[in-house]
């Protein structure tokens, strides 16, 4: 038992916010500005993310943990921990390499982001358009014919709309 | 079309300065930033610094205390200044866009060589 | 500074081929990584941001892929124009900092 405690890497005392510093003989010594270390036994402290441009600071860098960047107003964030800013559009409307435009007659966005969705097909699953679609807003599919007798059970609602996918631009 | 077109001497001898006017047509200097990245013969890219839309700047800790970057948004113009030359300072320096989607270089000016020599 | 390394400097391929370029920083830089194109004599070209994001104009025989710190740039279907050295780049933090460069040459 005391062999193997003696064995153990001193590191592993240094808890986060520290680095284990080889050059003052593996004593732990707080992580430098502007640099971090979110898990204990770290040799070195990661420099912070620093959100400069479309990337504001959502979330100030400690010794413990990274800043996070979000986008400036207009834009929304794309990729892992946001590492991109892609420009807001207008619902109704979808982002393409000439910038934003309307949805096309029979597609909608109800979003500020992400690409014009096609109109539910109500008649696929045996239902009528109860409230027709626009830019903005899906169809709403109400009961088939047949069940607009008296007594038919009411309108059923719409089904939530998925989260658009983003292409790679 | 975005373009970027730089301007600036050829030769200039040791302890001098360099200065280069990168003029940009296509785009705004209010709305996008403008970085200097150089590349010395043969090798890699070595970051220099960057003038924001709205003004500020950011330089590389490096070159901090011989480095200056300006610009005018009315004549679409950005101006680097770079003292104390030196002949590792041989390199050709571009001008670069700023993405509007991240921090990175979209489009870039055509260069400019730069030897340092007596 | 974060470092990137790009530990192959030469590569040889042939048209038709698929190469990948790799990329390592020194530390998680998340996908803060930009990639460029410089074809001999010409200024760099931007290629893929955000570790993944293709510019606009560029071919979809490019894609970039990784996070944390290993990051890749693949060509499908190699084209004679492809010759060129590529680069990385760093935006999690200043300085921003690049690859030393990989040369792509065609055979």
């Known amino acids: 038992f005391e062999r193997t405690r003696s064995l153990q890497d001193p590191c592993s005392n240094c808890p986060a916010g520290t680095f284990c510093d080889n050059n003052r003989n593996q004593i732990c010594s707080p992580c430098p500005p502007n640099s971090f270390s979110s898990a204990g036994g770290q040799r070195t402290c990661d420099i912070c993310r620093q959100c400069k441009g479309v990337f504001r600071t959502r979330k100030e860098c400690s010794s413990t943990s990274n800043a996070e960047c979000d986008c400036t107003p207009g834009f929304h964030c794309l990729g892992a921990g946001c590492s991109m800013c892609e420009q807001d559009c207008k619902q109704g409307q979808e982002l393409t390499k000439k910038g934003c435009k309307d949805c096309c007659f029979g597609t909608f966005n109800d979003q500020k982001r992400g690409i014009c969705r096609p109109w539910t097909n109500c008649s696929l699953d045996g239902k009528s358009v109860l409230v027709n679609g626009t830019k903005e807003r899906d169809v709403v599919c109400g009961p088939s014919p047949a069940d607009l007798s008296p007594g038919a059970s009411s309108v059923t609602p719409p089904a939530p709309a998925r989260e658009p996918g983003h292409s790679p631009q | 079309q975005v373009q970027l077109k730089q301007s600036g001497p050829g030769l200039v001898q040791p302890s001098q300065s360099l200065s280069i006017t990168c003029t940009v047509s296509?785009?705004?200097?209010?709305?996008?930033?403008v970085h200097w990245v150089r590349q010395p013969p043969g090798k890699g890219l070595e970051w220099l610094g960057v003038?924001?839309?709205?003004?500020?700047?950011d330089y590389n800790d490096a070159f901090i205390s011989r480095l200056s970057i300006t610009k005018d948004n009315s004549t679409s113009q950005v101006f680097f200044k770079m003292n104390g030359l030196q002949a590792d300072d041989t390199a050709i320096y571009y001008c670069?866009?700023?993405?509007?989607?991240?921090?990175?270089?979209?489009?870039w000016g055509q260069g400019t060589t730069l030897t340092v020599s007596s | 500074d974060i470092v990137m390394t790009q530990s192959q400097k030469f590569m040889s391929t042939s048209v038709g081929d698929r190469v990948s370029v790799t990329c390592k920083a020194s530390?998680?830089?998340?996908?803060?990584v930009a990639w460029y194109q410089q074809r001999p004599g010409q200024s760099p070209k931007a290629l893929i941001c955000?570790?993944?994001y293709r510019y606009s104009g560029v071919p979809d025989r490019f894609t970039g892929s990784g996070s944390g710190t290993d990051f890749t740039l693949t060509i499908s279907n190699v084209q004679s124009e492809d010759l060129a050295e590529y680069f990385c780049?760093?935006?999690?933090?200043?300085?921003?900092?690049f690859g030393s460069g990989t040369k792509l040459e065609i055979k």
């Open positions: 670069a866009r700023n993405s509007i989607t991240s921090v990175s270089f979209d489009c």
């Open positions: 296509g785009f705004s200097l209010t709305t996008y930033g």
């Open positions: 003038i924001w839309s709205d003004g500020n700047t």
């Open positions: 530390q998680n830089v998340g996908t803060t």
């Open positions: 955000s570790a993944s």
């Open positions: 780049q760093q935006y999690n933090s200043y300085p921003l900092t």
